[in-house]
């Protein structure tokens, strides 16, 4: 049914879906706090621009009776139920923030006539790519995939003189929501990653992974996995690892590696960690990043979603344009806005761009050091440490195929 949008006459509302099934187990109260802080900043910015309007949020909670797995497994129906709730109330904001689960976002996008923008903190899967009115504020799987292909092909760096064309992917089904979709994208036979690699095998059992570490007949020296150092240790323990094995540990939303007092454990020496660059405020204030690290990225994406809406609202109001139009719904892309922690850039498809950082463990200092950075916006790699103190022979990454290159 046609739902009227509470989005005119100087009063602009944001519909926030507070789903029990969420990409990250973040207390809903924290997300509410993030939204409310975002609203306050938006109000301040609009006042600063001389725009005397009201901006509020309506939090839509599901009853949690049926869809109570807590993770994303039962999110498809929960998302649609919340949309039904909005429809029954005949009340929709100018923008929908949430859901975060790929399943629910995909289904909601399919099942609704989207004449309003949808902003998601999550929705990592490839099935949520290229959606005209969907904006994603946490790095989606496509961005990871493009980095990996770029890095595999790179062969002109002092520490990487071989192109790679093979990989193992460890995926055992217990991953967090972000990791699940990242690995799912790498596994998919039709994905860009699969298309560009000559050999790729998914390891699904712990034993398969453990056997590969010393298997002389392995087809690749490179293993991609997703999670934190503790996850790797549980799997690998103190087992011996062949000297030309390279483990790529995807751990995007974890900034513990950048803390001053962090020492890399010994089992991380043949691991390259892929994470996101810690946000840097334009003001370069030492407090620009003082959100609690564990809460940071997910709640911050909600907050930035509010700021993004405020940014677009300001532009449309200043231009005297209507908010309840397809033009507004399609405008949340190909732009940079001022986020909570500094500028946030969205690509042509409304997906957040970021700087990914590849870290290695220095054999000298036992500290994590930046090997290179990768700008997802321009799909370009920038080497940082030209003479890394690697564990690998000659301080070069080995070839991906056993028996060739530095051993």
């Amino acid at each position: 049914s046609q739902v009227s949008q509470n989005c005119h006459n100087g009063s602009y509302e944001i519909s926030v879906l507070m789903m029990g099934n969420s990409a990250f187990a973040e207390p809903l109260k924290n997300l509410e706090d993030a939204v409310n802080e975002g609203l306050e900043i938006v109000r301040g910015r609009l006042q600063n621009a001389g725009l005397n309007v009201t901006v509020n949020a309506t939090f839509m909670y599901s009853d949690g009776l049926i869809h109570n797995s807590g993770d994303c497994r039962s999110s498809t129906c929960e998302g649609l139920d919340l949309l039904r709730k909005i429809s029954n109330a005949q009340r929709m904001g100018c923008v929908l923030i949430g859901p975060s689960c790929t399943y629910s976002t995909f289904q909601m996008y399919l099942d609704t006539e989207l004449s309003y923008p949808m902003i998601s903190a999550g929705s990592f899967g490839l099935s949520c790519d290229y959606k005209e009115t969907l904006t994603r504020l946490m790095s989606p799987a496509r961005k990871l995939m493009y980095f990996l292909v770029n890095f595999w092909k790179t062969n002109d760096l002092p520490f990487k003189t071989y192109s790679w064309s093979t990989s193992y992917v460890y995926k055992n089904g217990t991953e967090t929501e972000d990791c699940f979709w990242y690995l799912n994208a790498l596994e998919a036979s039709v994905s860009y990653f699969s298309h560009e690699l000559g050999f790729k095998v998914v390891l699904r059992q712990d034993k398969e992974f453990q056997d590969i570490l010393m298997d002389h007949n392995r087809k690749s020296n490179v293993i991609i996995m997703c999670g934190g150092p503790e996850f790797l240790y549980k799997l690998k323990g103190d087992r011996a690892v062949a000297e030309d094995i390279v483990i790529i540990l995807v751990d995007l939303f974890n900034d513990q590696y950048f803390e001053d007092n962090v020492t890399a454990p010994d089992y991380m020496k043949n691991v390259l960690v892929l994470t996101l660059s810690p946000g840097n405020s334009l003001l370069n204030s030492s407090f620009s990043r003082n959100l609690s690290p564990t809460k940071r990225d997910f709640a911050l994406a909600y907050l930035n979603g509010i700021l993004l809406f405020g940014h677009m609202l300001k532009i449309f109001l200043e231009n005297g344009e209507n908010i309840t139009t397809p033009k507004f719904a399609h405008a949340f892309r190909n732009l940079t806005f001022e986020g909570y922690d500094g500028p946030v850039t969205l690509d042509d498809w409304g997906d957040v761009d970021s700087t990914m950082v590849l870290l290695y463990t220095s054999v000298d200092t036992k500290k994590y050091k930046v090997l290179l950075t990768y700008d997802t916006h321009v799909n370009k790699t920038y080497p940082v440490d030209m003479s890394p103190t690697f564990t690998w022979k000659n301080s070069k990454l080995p070839n991906d195929i056993t028996g060739r290159g530095p051993q």
Epitope: N30, D33, A34, E37, L39, E40, I41, V42, R43, G44, R45, L46, Q47, N48, L283, S285, S286, F287, N290, L291, S292, K295, A299, L303, E338, Y340
Partner: antibody
Framework: EVQLVESGGGLVKPGGSLKLSCAAS????????MHWVRQAPEKGLEWVAH????????YYADTVKGRFTISRDNVKNTLFLQMTSLRSEDTAMYYC??????????????WGQGTPLTVSS | QIVLTQSPALMSVSPGEKVTMTCSAS?????MYWYQQKPRSSPKPWIY???NLASGVPARFSGSGSGTSYSLTISSMEAEDAATYYC?????????FGSGTKLEIK
């Protein structure tokens, strides 16, 4: 460079009124919550009042509630503290400070140099 | 409101000595913040989120604690560390400061 410059302090008789100002520059003033904090001579810091970035949320210390009013002008990047029914115990150096109001970012990361208020007959 | 009690109120320490000052909260708080203030100067943020040093703060400083008990430690006292240190919480409204610990050099 972030700068907070307080002004408006001075000598006032008990029961009198005064308005303090804090001019902000070098940052997006409208993105930040702002506070007034005071320090009586040879004493510790005492938080006085807070106003959120969009002025929707305002808090006061019990000691000033009903007498002091915090406000801001996001166009002019200025914070104010209107003080009435002043008492001798309000004598202090008054600092403005900025913060955010979210999770761990609730730190007063920049402070002005302070403006002195003396309440005496 | 949450009351923060700092101890000791005054410390006189020789250069090179280890210094530990404490801040006790009347109710549990998630994080503690610390500020340094020198005479005739504004307070400076010193430690945030309990244990993170503000930019420019020497590595000899550290912060720790949880719940109702927090501390600031200087591993080896230097002359420039002489100042008053205030703890602060904003776990709940209103924000509150401790009464301060004055650190003098012997």
């Amino acid at each position: 460079e972030v700068q907070l410059v307080e002004s408006g302090g001075g000598l006032v008789k008990p029961g009198g009124s005064l308005k303090l100002s804090c001019a902000a520059s070098g940052f997006a003033f409208s993105d930040y919550g702002m506070h007034w904090v005071r320090q009586a001579p040879e004493k510790g810091l005492e938080w006085v009042a807070h106003i959120s970035s969009g002025s929707s949320t305002i808090y006061y210390a019990d000691t000033v509630k009903g007498r002091f009013t915090i406000s801001r002008d996001n166009v002019k990047n200025t914070l104010f503290l209107q003080m009435t029914s002043l008492r001798s115990e309000d004598t202090a150096m008054y600092y403005c400070a900025r913060s955010r109001n979210y999770y761990g970012s609730r730190v007063f990361d920049y402070w002005g140099q302070g403006t002195p208020l003396t309440v005496s007959s | 409101q949450i009351v923060l009690t700092q101890s000791p109120a005054l410390m006189s320490v020789s250069p090179g000595e280890k210094v530990t000052m404490t801040c006790s909260a009347s109710s549990s708080v998630n994080y503690m913040y610390w500020y340094q203030q020198k005479p005739r100067s504004s307070p400076k943020p010193w430690i945030y989120l309990t244990s993170n040093l503000a930019s420019g703060v020497p590595a000899r400083f550290s912060g720790s604690g949880s719940g109702t008990s927090y501390s600031l430690t200087i591993s080896s006292m230097e002359a420039e560390d002489a100042a008053t240190y205030y703890c602060q919480q904003w776990n709940s409204n209103p924000p509150t400061f401790g009464s301060g610990t004055k650190l003098e050099i012997k």
